[in-house]
């Protein structure tokens, strides 16, 4: 038992496969921990060991490679299940050895069960398409090195529990899916299934995914800064609460990161000494476009206060935007007692 | 201001052809998607087609699949509707509209009429 | 196809009275739907579109609501131009399709 390089339980490949389908998992090890791969590994003479521990147990044993019909069985750096069994649920372990080197990566695998209209506990992709754009596509996802290119598997795509056939805009073409003229409507979530024939059998592979239509970037335009705003003038008198939301649209972008911020003369409010609170909110639309409000507020303001310059800023992808917000000292109302009462000449 | 006007409509025999266009103006036509909208006499309003802003997108309603095509031109701010293997039952005033996924038909051209009869 | 279904076909009412036009989806639409006017020898006009939002220009006598499967649009005092064809049209799901109309005519 010497000294091996054990890089733990890698919980970041969280891999779900379901019942009764092939799987067919890669050794992390020469994904995201070693340098070489796995060709290389085995010219050098290191050799790859499975083994796996199951659910709810500590004890760690060997894979059965003897299983019929070679249920399980390894090629290279691949475990191959045809296919698996709920029992498979467990973790994995792949070590590559040889009398001088050891390294080895444990992996979750969990075996999940599906409904009749593919409904699990598995995590699903999303896939964004963007509204009214023309012809976009998504294509059944993972199913990779199942089958060689001489076989010609057959694919049936779903609309959650209904295949889809006659959709006007949802077009199954093989592997692909393309969406025309996009709509929110298009919403949901596809189910692709592949079906192939290996050494006598029939196999099934099934992926989901989630489409979500998102704003288009044809459409996009920078912030809108909604609030602060010129119609608007916050007076107020030396002990009020100040609160001066500041609300920005943002449009949809991908992968755009949009930013709200307040400054108070010039300076983020953390660098200065008022005691000033900023709270946010961020609502979404249905195409994910985003509302963001921050709401500035000081709870007893001074007449110092009142004479400061205060801006919403905003920034995207699309560009910065900013506005100052009018704020002003409430001139407070005679009292009738003194100045009205002078002013009518009594004394 | 925002303006489509039809063209092309006209007399045409059973099994003949025919190509309208809509030119447009006032709004930037190649960021709107554009939409074929027909009415025969006396009845109601029937979607015929729509193309996404950049043409490649294009629907049709089962009555004209695989007879008319819609494209569109955004270099000349033209939308067209060709019309093939013409029936009696397409005889009607055929609108141009452009459309936003959050508006509908927004604007509408003041149509062209297509009379299919022998 | 979402058939859209419209009633009452004509409605017969005197000017400054309050017109109510319906119309029923036969699936949810959610709030994608537009109501257009047309008169006679002219094209819609857009008056309504996300099912309560009065397009450009529309007087605020006009008002639309409902959503899913139910929509209403009311005209809350008719004017003499207000008498002409009514449609409503689903825009969420293509192929978009049209009610069949209700005339509003002059009592």
């Known amino acids: 038992s010497e000294r091996c390089d054990d890089w733990g339980l890698d919980t970041m490949r969280q891999i779900q496969v379901f019942e009764d389908e092939p799987a067919r998992i890669k050794c992390p090890l020469f994904e995201h921990f070693l340098k070489f791969n796995y060709s290389t590994a085995h010219s050098a003479g290191l050799t790859l060991i499975w083994y796996w521990t199951r659910q709810d147990r500590d004890l760690e044993e060997p894979i059965n490679f003897r299983l019929p019909e070679n249920r399980i069985s390894k090629e290279k750096d691949v475990l191959w299940f045809r296919p698996t069994l709920l029992n498979d649920t467990g973790n994995y372990t792949c070590m590559l050895r040889n009398t001088t080197y050891c390294s080895k990566v444990a992996f979750p695998l969990e075996v999940v069960q599906k409904d009749s209209c593919f409904n699990s506990p598995m995590k699903l992709p999303v896939h964004k398409l963007y509204i009214e754009y023309g012809i976009q596509r998504i294509t059944c996802p993972n199913v990779d090195g199942y089958f060689p290119s001489s076989v010609k598997p057959t694919i049936t795509w779903y609309m959650g529990c209904y295949k889809i056939q006659n959709f006007n805009n949802v077009i199954p073409e093989g592997m692909n899916l393309s969406f025309l003229i996009a709509l929110i409507s298009n919403n949901g979530n596809y189910t692709c299934v592949v079906t192939y024939p290996e050494n006598g059998r029939t196999f099934h592979l099934t992926r989901t995914l989630t489409v979500k239509v998102v704003g288009s970037p044809k459409n996009a335009v920078p912030p809108v800064i909604h609030s602060p705003n010129d119609h608007v003038v916050y007076e107020k008198e030396p002990g009020e609460e100040l609160l001066i939301p500041c609300t920005v649209y943002f449009s949809f972008l991908m992968d755009s990161r949009n930013e709200v911020w307040w400054t108070i003369d010039g300076k983020k409010p953390d660098d200065i000494t008022i005691d000033v609170t900023i709270n946010e909110s961020i609502s979404h639309s249905r195409t994910e476009d985003e509302t963001r409000t921050q709401i500035l507020s000081i709870k007893k303001v001074t007449s110092e206060d009142l004479k400061r310059s205060y801006v919403c800023h905003a920034r995207s992808a699309k560009g910065e935007v900013a506005k100052a917000a009018k704020v002003k000292q409430k001139v407070p109302a005679p009292r009738y007692t003194v100045e009205l009462a002078c002013g009518f000449g009594a004394t | 201001e925002v303006q489509l006007l039809e063209s092309g409509g006209g007399l045409v025999q059973p099994g003949g052809s025919l190509r309208l266009s809509c030119a447009a103006s006032?709004?930037?036509?190649?960021?709107?998607?554009m939409g074929w909208v027909r009415q025969a006499p006396g009845k109601g309003l029937e979607w015929v087609s729509a193309?996404?802003?950049?043409?490649?997108?294009?629907l049709y309603a089962d009555s004209v699949k695989g007879r008319f095509t819609i494209s569109r031109d955004n270099s000349k701010n033209t939308l067209y509707l060709q019309m093939n293997s013409l029936r009696a039952e397409d005889t009607a005033v055929y609108y141009c509209?452009?459309?936003?996924?959050?508006?509908?038909?927004?604007?509408w051209g003041q149509g062209t009429l297509v009379t299919v009869s022998s | 196809e979402i058939v859209m279904t419209q009633s009452p076909a004509t409605l017969s009412v005197s000017p400054g009275e309050r017109a109510t036009l319906s119309c029923r989806a036969s699936?949810?639409?959610?709030?994608?739907l537009a109501w257009y006017q047309q008169k006679p020898g002219q094209a819609p006009r857009l008056l309504i579109y996300?099912?309560?939002t009065r397009a450009t220009g529309i007087p605020a006598r006009f008002s639309g609501s409902g959503s899913g499967t139910e929509f209403t649009l009311t005209i809350s005092s008719l004017q003499s131009e207000d008498f002409a064809v009514y449609y409503c049209?689903?825009?969420?799901?293509?192929?978009?399709?049209f009610g069949q109309g209700t005339k509003v005519e002059i009592k």
């Open positions: 509209a452009r459309f936003r996924y959050y508006t509908a038909f927004d604007y």
């Open positions: 006032g709004f930037i036509f190649s960021t709107y998607g």
């Open positions: 193309i996404s802003y950049d043409g490649e997108g294009t």
């Open positions: 699936q949810s639409v959610s709030s994608n």
């Open positions: 996300g099912a309560s």
């Open positions: 049209q689903q825009y969420n799901n293509w192929p978009w399709t």
